[in-house]
């Protein structure tokens, strides 16, 4: 129980895509402000988004320090203009978030087909290796750098004249598929982490078709 004019945050929700991670909560503040704290299970609490009237807090900088750790956040409520005020128990009112393990739970962002090249009856399709906000030695790591072979891509490909989608899979960012000579094909890719039980798939990439500028055709 806090002071009469503050309410505890609720519906604390992690929103995370390719490790860009934001904690959201309710309600919109009326005469109150919020501060967020985050910690690993064994670590110390670190305060973020001090005395904010927002109902979200970007915690990316904290979670990218170790994406395999499990994090817990909490949102404190303070009366606006009187942030030293505490609840009746001598503590500000706060609510805990669910636990969050970025490596296991971050959503996979929509992939992009970088290019495709046809050589005779083979097509090489390359998926863009998206940069994340995870750093190592002052360098931003790509999605492939972070997930390694845990990340696979499924390619859906089909003749422009047909509806049936064939599939191919790779644990790199490249596909080499067989196609029929003289046929135009369309492509879409999906990122998947098969070892996960939730948040396993990305949305599909935009469809790219042969005869458009992304591709290159060489008759051999």
């Amino acid at each position: 129980s806090g002071t009469t004019n503050t309410v505890a945050a609720y519906n604390l929700t992690w929103k995370s895509t390719n490790f860009k991670t934001i904690l959201e909560w309710e309600p919109k503040p009326v005469n109150q402000v919020y501060t967020v704290q985050i910690s690993t299970k064994s670590g110390d609490w670190k305060s973020k988004c001090f005395y904010t009237t927002d109902t979200e807090c970007d915690l990316t900088d904290e979670i990218v320090k170790d994406v395999k750790q499990t994090y817990l956040a909490r949102v404190f409520s303070y009366p606006a203009g009187n942030v030293e005020s505490t609840g009746s128990a001598g503590e500000p009112l706060y609510e805990n978030s669910p636990e969050f393990t970025p490596y296991l739970e971050t959503n996979l962002g929509q992939p992009t087909i970088q290019s495709f090249e046809q050589v005779g009856t083979k097509v090489n399709v390359t998926v863009e290796d998206e940069r994340t906000l995870v750093r190592r030695n002052n360098t931003f790591l790509s999605l492939r750098d972070v997930f390694g072979k845990d990340l696979i891509y499924t390619l859906y490909y089909w003749k422009s004249s047909s509806s049936g989608k064939k599939t191919a899979k790779t644990n790199t960012n490249e596909f080499l598929i067989d196609v029929d000579k003289g046929e135009n094909y369309c492509f879409s890719v999906q990122a998947v982490i098969p070892s996960r039980t939730v948040n396993r798939k990305s949305t599909d990439s935009p469809v790219e078709c042969m005869g458009q500028e992304k591709g290159e055709f060489r008759e051999i």
Epitope: P194, T197, K201
Partner: antibody, heavy 120, light 107 residues
């Protein structure tokens, strides 16, 4: 516990139709690919087709193309196999199976199967 | 479509025997081959995936290997519960295709 349960099999006349259901529990079909595989009496396994419930993409074996349609209802966590213009050679036990979309693309869980008999 | 030619179609063996079943792919399928066990009236069960990885809960007497387009399932010491039909399957490309099956019978 992951489970797939097929239903809807039975006796149907040549040229008739039947809809099979594959009800999933213990996982959400949206996150996987669902395949249908059949096995004629005393014969081997024959792949029928797949659906990716996250985007509705499908592909069918030549032997059923134009006659069979696979669909999915993610709110019911169920995949379907609509079989039209049935022939005697479609008589088989029909299984649905889950594909975790790994590079090896194994089918890691199968239903118990439902028997479809096409006969006059 | 890729053909998976499985041999032998049947074999007789005794408990404790080492059993080898082979599948040959008609073209390169990388390691995208799985092996299944099926008993009469039951659904197939996954044994081996990605050519050589033992699926969770499968006894270690089962193993898989690859040499080019040839794939092998080995049962190091046949147990009474291993008498069944075994199928290989490729899913390197659509459509996925199965071998014709190998029935392992009691000698």
């Amino acid at each position: 516990e992951v489970q797939l349960v097929e239903s809807g099999g039975g006796l149907v006349q040549p040229g008739g139709s039947l809809r099979l259901s594959c009800a999933a529990s213990g996982f959400t079909i949206f996150d996987y690919i669902i395949h249908w595989v059949r096995q004629a009496p005393g014969k081997g396994l024959e792949w029928v087709g797949y659906i990716d419930p996250s985007n509705g993409y499908t592909y069918y074996a030549d032997s059923v193309k134009g006659r069979f349609t696979i669909s999915a209802d993610t709110s019911k966590n169920t995949a379907y196999l609509q079989m039209n213009s049935l022939r005697a050679e479609d008589t088989a036990v029909y299984y649905c199976a889950r594909d975790p979309q790994s590079v090896g693309s194994e089918f890691d869980y199968w239903g118990q199967g439902t028997l479809v008999t096409v006969s006059s | 479509d890729i053909q998976m030619t499985q041999s032998p179609s049947s074999l007789s063996a005794s408990v404790g025997d080492r059993v080898t079943i082979t599948c040959r792919a008609s073209q390169d399928v990388n390691t995208a081959v799985a092996w299944y066990q099926q008993k009469p009236g039951k659904a197939p069960k996954l044994l081996i995936y990605s050519a050589s990885f033992l699926y969770s809960g499968v006894p270690s007497r089962f193993s898989g290997s690859r040499s080019g387009t040839d794939f092998t399932l080995t049962i190091s010491s046949l147990q009474p519960e291993d008498f069944a039909t075994y199928y290989c399957q490729q899913h390197y490309t659509t459509p996925p295709t199965f071998g014709q099956g190998t029935k392992v019978e009691i000698k």
